[in-house]
Interface confidence: medium
């Protein structure tokens, strides 16, 4: 009889990340009697992927029911295949023997690639904001992709920009791949509503491309203007001053008014109204008792935007020309005497 | 690691005084808004008083407003909580917290100390 | 002031179940609204930022939600450690004030 034979008859197999990878393997032969054992790699450091007689391998199943006398398909199939799963597989024949068995034949060996899509892309922007006209860097990260072929465009709202660089890791032979690029956007006033996307292709994408994107909104600050406006008289002794913050990006916004250097009244920034360009306005007012100052007032419109240093306007209240009012000593409608900016 | 040890608690007569001390280390004391918070026995939470980090912003609550008086001393990593004119109902356990987001309030608490026990009682 | 209404006050429930705690605010405080788990004869500790963000480190068995006047403090699956005082906070505006605690207990 002849003697029995291995056969791999697929030199190589290409699967898909996270499908099942059928390894073929057939004996030419019942004889001699023993079992089979898949082996990852050649030589004393290989891996043991499938022991027919003992052993707990939950991701592989056998094609064939390998207990029966007359098997001889000794093919397996390997579920939920990673690119870590990628290498050369043997199918390798034992002969019963005692008390161990002993190696008889090996299969040529089928070469398992894997093809393994990108991870969604995660685009990452500075980790503190920024003011319109400065310059930012978005990182693009996709990660575990095979073959290392791939490509990378960065877009701004639709328009495909051109100030980036781009790496691929690691250089040399690996079972999967990285890609990292950064590219430079410009900030503009407008920016409150833009996208910075970038997009991945890949073999494995089957020419849908996976995009991953930044909001410009988280990114971007754009600080505020202040106009402080004195409004008709309402009633005697009483004068509303009113203080527009404009233009400003994000909503945490603080505004302190102060009279003559002292605190009067602080309030966060509520009901605000949003313009079409993704910034908000909000109006802050303060009614005056002319009465209770015997000189002019400096009024003060002081705000507090999203953590920065304080901006101020201010305007000069003439009180001069108001008649004086007796046992008045009321400035402004909630005002304290406190000092320091203490509330 | 990231650490708040408060320290000055005691025993004290209504009327009196007391000056908590709150020691940081493990972060870039400089940068944080810090928060004084305080639980009566067997009661909820109660906020006492905020300090902005350059100590520009200073907000009390009405139950302790003119009475207690927060400040902080970067230089030495240090928070403070000056108590004059204690009452009874200011007995509590004394937490300081470290804010969660640099250089701005309004975030919540992330770190907090064990505590110091101040009662006020005759 | 913003009053932060908290129920139930106090909850007991068997391991596995699943807990939800509601806070009401007196008004708008948008996401500003944190929630914290106290143990006894412990400090608090941060578990939910922003309404609905998991601090880092804190089981995913907790979560948040909700946005306005209304949100939600729910535990998936309750474990023994679980055993604490849970309390929402809001930061919309000064004072800060927090909710009057739930005590979760095991049957």
């Known amino acids: 009889e002849e003697e029995l034979q291995v056969i791999q008859p697929d030199k190589s197999v290409l699967v898909a990340a996270g499908e099942t990878a059928t390894l073929r393997c057939t004996a030419t032969s019942l004889i001699p009697v023993g079992p089979i054992q898949w082996f990852r790699g050649a030589g004393p450091g290989r891996e043991l992927i499938y022991n027919q007689k003992e052993g707990h391998f939950p991701r592989v199943t056998t094609v064939s029911d390998l207990t029966k006398r007359n098997n001889m398909d000794f093919s397996i199939r390997i579920g939920n295949i990673t690119p870590a799963d990628a290498g050369t597989y043997y199918c390798v024949k034992f002969r019963k023997g005692s008390p161990d068995d002993v190696e008889f034949k090996s299969g040529a060996g089928t070469e398992l690639s894997v093809r393994a899509k990108p991870s969604a892309p995660v685009v990452s922007g500075p980790a503190a904001r920024a003011t319109p006209q400065h310059t930012v860097s978005f990182t693009c990260e996709s990660h575990g992709f095979s073959p290392r072929d791939i490509t990378l465009k960065w877009f701004k709202n639709g328009n495909e920009l051109s100030d980036f660089q781009t790496n691929v890791d690691p250089v040399g032979e690996s079972v999967s791949y990285s890609i990292h690029s950064t590219a430079k956007v410009v900030l503009t006033r407008e920016d409150v509503h833009s996208q910075v996307i970038c997009e991945v292709a890949h073999v494995t994408l089957q020419g849908d491309p996976l995009r991953g994107t930044a909001n410009l909104s988280e990114t971007i600050r754009v600080p505020p203007t202040l106009e402080v406006t004195q409004q008709p008289v309402r009633a005697e002794n009483q004068v509303n001053v009113t203080c527009q913050v404009r233009k400003f990006y994000p909503q945490r916004l603080q505004l302190t008014w102060l009279e003559n250097g002292n605190v009067s009244r602080t309030e966060t920034a509520s009901t605000v109204t949003e313009n079409k360009d993704g910034t908000y306005n909000w109006m802050s007012w303060l009614l005056v008792n002319v009465s209770a100052h015997r000189d002019d007032v400096k009024l003060t419109c002081q705000v507090e935007h999203d953590g920065q240093p304080a901006v101020s306007k201010s305007h000069d209240l003439k009180v001069s020309a108001h008649p004086k009012e007796q046992g008045s000593n009321t400035a402004a409608e909630n005002t304290g005497s406190n000092e320091r900016n203490i509330y | 690691q990231v650490q708040l040890v408060e320290s000055g608690g005691g025993l004290v007569k209504p009327g009196g005084s007391l000056r908590l001390s709150c020691a940081a280390s493990?972060?870039?004391?400089?940068?944080?808004?810090m928060h004084w918070v305080r639980q009566a026995p067997g009661k909820g939470l109660e906020w006492v008083s905020s300090i902005s980090s350059s100590d520009s912003w200073i907000y009390y609550a009405d139950s302790v407003k003119g009475r207690f008086t927060i400040s902080r001393d970067n230089a030495k990593n240090s928070l403070y909580l000056q108590m004059d004119s204690l009452r009874a109902e200011d007995t509590a356990v004394y937490y300081c917290?470290?804010?969660?987001?640099?250089?701005?309030?309004?975030?919540?608490?992330?770190?907090w100390g064990q505590g110091t026990t101040v009662t006020v009682s005759s | 002031d913003i009053q932060m209404t908290q129920s139930p006050s106090s909850l007991s429930a068997s391991v596995g179940d699943r807990v939800t705690i509601t806070c009401q605010a007196s008004q708008d405080i948008s996401n500003y609204l944190n929630w914290y788990q106290q143990k006894p004869g412990k400090a608090p500790k941060l578990l939910i930022y922003?309404?609905?963000n998991l601090e880092t480190g804190v089981p995913s068995r907790f979560s948040g939600s909700g946005s306005g006047t209304d949100f939600t403090f729910t535990i998936s699956s309750l474990q023994p450690e679980d055993i604490a005082t849970y309390y929402c906070q809001q930061l919309s505006n000064y004072p800060i004030t927090f909710g009057g605690g739930t005590k979760v207990e095991i049957k």
């Open positions: 917290a470290k804010e969660r987001v640099d250089y701005w309030h309004g975030y919540g608490m992330d770190v």
């Open positions: 493990g972060f870039t004391f400089s940068s944080y808004s």
């Open positions: 922003d309404a609905s």
